[in-house]
């Protein structure tokens, strides 16, 4: 007998999602228009390519990276796409309302789509901690709250701390990680007897997760350089990110082997550790003056990632109910913090090098920014978790966690598909 979507969700989801989509269309109709200025077409194409890289990262990279569960791979990929599509629409409007609205209309440019895709990426990072335990109706709520929280965080940081697009978007790693972990903490944790096999990884889904990791690995330099305002800063960011992720791959594979008693390589470690360098270098990728520093960062990040993957899952599974293979949350939280610390160190070196007496104040500002990002992530994450626990969403029963058949129509109804 095939498992069906609960009746109430079948009524609730289409109504909720389509009403929301209709509302978004109306908001776009009344409040937005395209940038009408004529521009050099070559520049337009180049600008679009950066946005395309970000979309590939989000849809294919993060979509497949989270698809390693034996019985939840379809849902991981498709739900990611659903959240990305919804998140980008809401993020474009929100960013426009927060930054442009005094002029009466939100002007949509390729840059605003780029920003929106990066905001939506935040949700895709966070959701790794809860995928398999929530339905689409709940994910819609999560998208709306997280994109709103991140948009407001960026606006506050921009206004209070005077930071640019790149700097306030690079808090995304820490923000997304802590948001996801705090939502996971609120959701029902125990996996009932008989469902343990569902949160295990299988060979084919693990291969698709590796494919996701490869796409992220290839396009991470685009992500870290997308919001920088000059060619020289972008060039630096691309080079440094590339060196960092290259070293973190070598470190991840060799470190994973080192961490295993028989010297075997863990798929789960490798999936996430290959990206470690890109996350750690993100905040300061345009500032790092030479390749060796980016490479050292990639090495340290890879080791932290493998170490975290070895020792943290037990704790996360007990406390937060996060399965062993969903290690993006705590991985990004550690590596995001490392990246922020590196930025603060570089800031201090710059201040010392300039003979500037403002070191303490500059460090305090940076710590203030980071603390604000973590606090808003935790608070909005807890709020989202509480909202997701409301009965109206008809959350999947714990026995139906990590099960594609709850959500998808499979003609052959095979359990192992």
């Amino acid at each position: 007998m095939s498992s069906k979507y609960p009746r109430s969700v079948r009524r609730c989801l289409p109504l909720w999602a389509l009403t929301l989509e209709a509302a978004l269309i109306l908001l776009f109709y009344f409040f937005t228009h395209y940038d009408a200025s004529l521009e050099d077409q070559k520049g337009l194409v180049a600008s679009y390519q950066v946005g395309q890289d970000l979309t590939v990262m989000a849809a294919i990279g993060l979509g497949f990276l989270t698809s390693s569960f034996r019985r939840h791979s379809w849902s991981s990929v498709a739900f990611n796409l659903f959240m990305l599509a919804l998140g980008v629409q809401w993020a474009i409007l929100l960013d426009g309302f927060l930054s442009q609205f005094p002029s009466g209309k939100v002007v949509i440019t390729l840059f605003s789509i780029r920003l929106a895709t990066m905001s939506a990426l935040s949700v895709l990072i966070s959701v790794d901690a809860v995928l398999g335990k929530v339905n689409l109706a709940q994910l819609v709520v999560m998208v709306l709250v997280e994109v709103t929280a991140l948009g407001n965080l960026r606006m506050v940081i921009s206004n209070i701390f005077n930071t640019d697009y790149h700097m306030n978007m690079m808090h995304i790693y820490v923000f997304a990680a802590y948001f996801g972990l705090s939502v996971a903490w609120c959701l029902p944790k125990p996996l009932p007897e008989g469902t343990e096999d569902k949160d295990q990884t299988a060979t084919i889904p693990s291969l698709s997760a590796m494919l996701g990791a490869l796409f992220l690995w290839m396009f991470w330099p685009s992500f870290n350089s997308a919001l920088l305002r000059s060619p020289i800063e972008r060039k630096n960011a691309v080079f440094n990110t590339y060196y960092a992720v290259a070293v973190s791959v070598v470190t991840a594979i060799s470190g994973s082997s080192l961490a295993h008693p028989q010297g075997k390589i863990s798929k789960t470690y490798v999936h996430s550790a290959v990206l470690a360098g890109g996350v750690a270098v993100g905040t300061s990728c345009h500032l790092i003056p030479s390749p060796w520093l980016a490479m050292v960062l990639g090495l340290v990040a890879g080791l932290i990632s493998v170490g975290g993957a070895k020792y943290l899952p037990g704790c996360c599974n007990r406390v937060l109910g996060i399965p062993h293979s969903s290690i993006m949350g705590y991985n990004f939280s550690l590596l995001g913090l490392l990246g922020e610390i590196i930025y603060i160190v570089l800031l201090v070196l710059d201040t010392v090098g300039a003979g500037n007496g403002m070191i303490g104040f500059q460090v305090l500002l940076s710590i203030g920014e980071l603390s604000l990002a973590i606090v808003i992530a935790l608070m909005s994450g807890l709020l989202t978790g509480l909202l997701l626990n409301l009965k109206i969403w008809k959350a999947p029963h714990e026995a139906k966690y990590f099960d594609d058949q709850v959500f998808w129509k499979f003609p052959h109804l095979a359990v192992g598909f």
Partner: antibody, heavy 126, light 106 residues
């Protein structure tokens, strides 16, 4: 090679009407630099108006001109534009285009407006 | 960040040492530039990143400061230095300018 920013398009215009300023660049790789418009009302200080990134991907405006002015560039023609709509008396000023250069400090990047156009006067009057 | 220059004008003689101050409403790190504008001309960059002298600018101009408090010093005023001086922050958009300091002949 001498870096030049040659401005044109200023003049007298009635309130509510439109005007388009141009700034033709030569002597440097135009597509590698962010470009700005800065204005100066008669007898007053300098006021930043707008910026466009090197690849045209992003534009930012001063609150006083948001929704009325549009900055754009054509990298194939080495030209920067400022389309000014719904002009008001308070928009009367000399408008300058300026090149933004990014230079590395000890570690952080620093920005400077190292080359300026000669300026073009826009008078909004009925 | 808003910038406030002082004094708004000053009178000095050739050979004098002149100091102009610029205060920011919030920390702008080292993102501060100084420009000189002669009557009827476009502004010209003198000093960038607080203390770096722009190529072609005379060495009698120097900048200093940190965080929120900055100064431009002209060690020995020359006849061609009688002009208006503006500070500008390039820390974040909008890239605001100070209101200007006019240096006049005594």
């Amino acid at each position: 090679e001498v870096q030049l920013l040659e401005q044109s398009g200023g003049g007298v215009v009635q309130p509510g009407r439109s005007l388009r300023l141009s700034c033709a660049a030569s002597g440097f790789t135009f597509s590698s630099y962010g470009m700005h418009w800065v204005r100066q009302a008669p007898g007053k200080g300098l006021e930043w108006v707008a910026v466009i990134w090197f690849d045209g991907s992003n534009k930012e405006y001063a609150d006083s001109v948001k929704g009325r002015f549009t900055i754009s560039r054509d990298n194939s023609k080495n030209t920067l534009y400022l389309q000014m709509n719904s002009l008001r008396a308070e928009d009367t000023a000399v408008y300058y285009c300026a090149r933004e250069e990014v230079v590395r400090g000890v570690i952080l990047w620093s920005r400077k407006f190292d080359y300026w156009g000669q300026g073009t006067l826009v008078t909004v009057s009925s | 960040a808003e910038l406030t220059q002082s004094p708004s004008s000053l009178s000095a003689s050739v050979g004098d040492r002149v100091t102009i101050t610029c205060r920011a409403s919030q920390t702008i790190g080292r993102y501060l530039n100084w420009y000189q504008q002669r009557p009827g001309k476009a502004p010209k960059l003198l000093v960038y990143a607080v203390s770096s002298l722009q190529s072609g600018a005379p060495s009698r101009f120097s900048g200093s400061g940190s965080g929120t408090h900055f100064t431009l010093t002209i060690t020995s005023l020359q006849p061609e230095d009688f002009a208006t001086y503006f500070c500008q922050q390039s820390y974040s958009s909008p890239f605001t300018f100070g209101q200007g300091t006019k240096v006049e002949i005594k």
